[in-house]
Every structure is written in structure tokens, then in C-alpha cells.
């Protein structure tokens, strides 16, 4: 047979204080006068009792009825309930891309580059000791790297013979031209580094 | 040799309108922020507004002073930055720096700045 | 806005003095500040970035240092033609904003 509601709400008492009863599937739910709280509005209302202030905000009461939450940095919203986005400001370096976090941001870089603002080169010569073959030489740079070619081998990683006429000649490959000048090693903060 | 040129600083009227330019050479303009920063005679350092470079799609930021009534552009096949200033202010009254942003968090390369006087 | 409060607005010093100006600012700023020397009439120069690192061509007299929100620029030994006044700013994020300066004056 069809379940029918029972409309708890036919049998009085159950929301106290001039409640007003809301009946529910299968329950019922008590709307509180100012004042009153609780399941059954069986309790005073204390506006910082428990405090309604989330993500570590700290309530005040401001009235009998009213209260004011006081966010901690990175947070907003009447009850602290919404993190701040912080990317509209950020500040990411060498091609890196926001990332919010809360009262700051992170940086998402591209593979040459690492640290919070992507402002540390990553030194690829350490991270591929092969990457340049045949006694090549290999040479970090800002946003790249490059290999030095020993006399005989030319090409991107000195793949590449040459010619016996051409052998005097050494070849510095640029792996990726960027014209950043400097590397740069954020100290402390290493938790929110975020390598790549 | 990384140099930035500014020009288009000169006398106008309360309310009236200034382009200024920025002319950069010695390298890639389109990989890195650029500043607009002024400082009133006497004063300290003020930011005014900034582009982003193209990875981070040339986005814009003004500082609340300026925040719609001056607009930043870049000419990437003229390697020129601009600043249009509309409704001026005696208080913008000021030398306009351009100012390139180095990749690390600071501004290494500075324009020899304009003069924008806003006057009746 | 990050606030930058920077001590002292002034100084008189001799040739051969230690010379300590601070920045201070509102919230950690990850050691993302620069120090910039203006002398009369001339733009800003970068000196320090990234709270302790030499720009290219600065003299090694030059030196910062700190983290968080106290940050410190030195110079050991002032020269003739490091009279001029000095900025601290924080590039952690827009608005980039900048200490009030302080002028180094011939004592």
C-alpha cells in the first residue's frame, strides 16, 4: 500500500514559545520566534552561543538578536563563509598561472621554472645529467637550457656530426630563448612552493 | 640594452584628456609585465596601473585612484605601452614612469619619465 | 592594500658609515620586496630584489635581508654616491604599493 505523511504537525506542543510547525516528509521542523532557538525553540537565543562564524572568524554579539562576525585574512561573508580570491591580484612570474589559496596564491609554472611565483629557474642540466650527448657540455640558462658541443657534433642536444670541414665549430643551442636575466630563490615559505 | 622612452606628458586642464607612450627596445616586449608608476614633485612612489604579459592573456590592473578614468594598452608590433588619462585631476599632476617587470617580483628597468601637469 | 611603513624618513650620515633603513609591511608578503635608489631628478634604480638578492651591477655594499613582513636594507660602507633616497616596495601582488622613502643626507 502508498506510505502516507503523518502530519506531525496536527498534534500540538511540539514547537514551544509560539513556534510556528513546518511539517516535513517523514518530519517536521519548528520556525522560531526572535529569541528562541532549538529543535522544539526550547532554548534562549544567544546570538554568539554556539558562535555561527566559520573558517575561524570571531563572533560578536551586537544586539539581543544580532551578531558580527570578525574574519580572519583571506575570508568575507556575513558568517566568514566565502575565501577570498586572491588571483585577480596575483603577481605570477614567467608565464605561471594563479592559483588561489587562502589569503594568498600560488603559481602554476611552466616546466622551466619553479617557486611560489615561478620566479626560481629550474636548472635542467641536474635534472637531465644525459641531456646533452657526445662530451657535450650542457649550460643552464634562465627559461632553458643549452648544450656546448665538443668539436665533431653539432644540433639541439650534439646529436649531430659534422662535417670533417665544419669540425672547429662549436654549437650553442638555446632549448628554449626566453630573456629572463637572473635566477631568483625565494628563502623560507618553502610550503608553498609548488614544483613542477 | 633594455630601454624604455616615454613621451606624450604636457600641460592640460582639470577634466581634460593625456595619452602617454612608452617606446621599448632590447627585448621581448609581449613576456613581461608592464608598470605605469608617478610620483608627485616632492612625493614617494606611486603605482598607477599595469598590464600582465601574454602568457597571463595581457590582464589589467589599476591601482583605485585612476580605476576608470585611465586605461592601460600595449602595441606588441610597436613594442609600445600606453596610458590614456581622461577626466584629470590637479592630484594626477606627477612624472609618469613606465617600468618594465623583470620576471622577479621587482621593476629592473625604469623609462626617464614624463611630466604631467594638470592645471587651470 | 598591503601597507608599507618604512623608518626612518631620514638620515645624516658621513662617508664610511653603516647605514640601516627598515620596511615593515601590513602582511607577509613571501619576501617579495625590492629596494629601489632615486637620487634628484633621475628614475628609480633596482638594488635588492627578492629581500636579499644583488641586482646586476650593484655594488656589494648593498645588502638586504628579512622575511614575512620585517624587511632590512644595508649598506656597510657609504659611499659619496650613495647619498640619494631609497624605496622599498612589495611586488607579492597588485596593488604594488611602496614604503614613504628615506632620504640619506650628507651629515
Known amino acids: 500500500g502508498s506510505e502516507t505523511d503523518v502530519n506531525e504537525c496536527d498534534i500540538p506542543g511540539h514547537c514551544q514559545h509560539g513556534g510556528t510547525c513546518l511539517n516535513l516528509p517523514g518530519s517536521y521542523q519548528c520556525q522560531c520566534l526572535q529569541g528562541f532557538t532549538g529543535q522544539y525553540c526550547d532554548s534562549l537565543y544567544v546570538p554568539c552561543a554556539p558562535s555561527p562564524c566559520v573558517n575561524g572568524g570571531t563572533c560578536r554579539q551586537t544586539g539581543d538578536f544580532t551578531f558580527e562576525c570578525n574574519c580572519l585574512p583571506g575570508f568575507e561573508g556575513s558568517t566568514c563563509e566565502r575565501n577570498i580570491d586572491d588571483c585577480p591580484n596575483h603577481r605570477c612570474q614567467n608565464g605561471g598561472v594563479c592559483v588561489d589559496g587562502v589569503n594568498t596564491y600560488n603559481c602554476r609554472c611552466p616546466p622551466q621554472w619553479t617557486g611560489q611565483f615561478c620566479t626560481e629557474d629550474v636548472d635542467e642540466c641536474l635534472l637531465q645529467p644525459n641531456a646533452c650527448q657526445n662530451g657535450g657540455t650542457c649550460a643552464n640558462r634562465n627559461g632553458g637550457y643549452g648544450c656546448v658541443c665538443v668539436n665533431g657534433w653539432s644540433g639541439d642536444d650534439c646529436s649531430e656530426n659534422i662535417d670533417d670541414g665544419n669540425s672547429g665549430l662549436n654549437d650553442i643551442f638555446e632549448a628554449q630563448k626566453i630573456e629572463w636575466h637572473e635566477n631568483l630563490y625565494f628563502q623560507g615559505h618553502h610550503h608553498h612552493h609548488h614544483h613542477h | 640594452e633594455v630601454q624604455l622612452v616615454e613621451s606624450g606628458g604636457g600641460l592640460v586642464q582639470p577634466g581634460g584628456s593625456l595619452k602617454l607612450s612608452c617606446a621599448v627596445s632590447g627585448f621581448t616586449f609581449s613576456d613581461f609585465y608592464m608598470e605605469w608608476v608617478r610620483q608627485a614633485s616632492g612625493k614617494g612612489l606611486e603605482w598607477v596601473a599595469a598590464q600582465r604579459n601574454k602568457a597571463n592573456d595581457f590582464s589589467i590592473v589599476y591601482s583605485a585612484s585612476v580605476k576608470d578614468r585611465f586605461t592601460i594598452s600595449r602595441d606588441d608590433s610597436k613594442s609600445t605601452l600606453y596610458l590614456q588619462m581622461n577626466s584629470l585631476k590637479t592630484e594626477d599632476t606627477a612624472v609618469y614612469y613606465c617600468?618594465?617587470?623583470?620576471?622577479?617580483?621587482?621593476?629592473?628597468?625604469w623609462g626617464q619619465g614624463t611630466l604631467v601637469t594638470v592645471s587651470s | 592594500d598591503i601597507q608599507m611603513t618604512q623608518s626612518p624618513s631620514s638620515v645624516s650620515a658621513s662617508v664610511g658609515d653603516r647605514v640601516t633603513i627598515t620596511c615593515q609591511t601590513s602582511e607577509d608578503i613571501y619576501s617579495g620586496l625590492a629596494w629601489y635608489q632615486q637620487k634628484p631628478g633621475k628614475s628609480p634604480k633596482l638594488l635588492i630584489y627578492?629581500?636579499?638578492r644583488l641586482q646586476d651591477g650593484v655594488p656589494s655594499r648593498f645588502s638586504g635581508s628579512g622575511s614575512g613582513t620585517d624587511y632590512t636594507l644595508t649598506i656597510s660602507s657609504l659611499q659619496p654616491e650613495d647619498f640619494a633616497t631609497y624605496y622599498c616596495?612589495?611586488?607579492?601582488?597588485?596593488?604594488?604599493?611602496f614604503g614613504g622613502g628615506t632620504k640619506v643626507e650628507i651629515k
Open positions: 627578492g629581500a636579499s
Open positions: 616596495q612589495q611586488g607579492f601582488k597588485y596593488p604594488l604599493t
Open positions: 617600468s618594465r617587470d623583470g620576471g622577479k617580483l621587482a621593476l629592473d628597468a
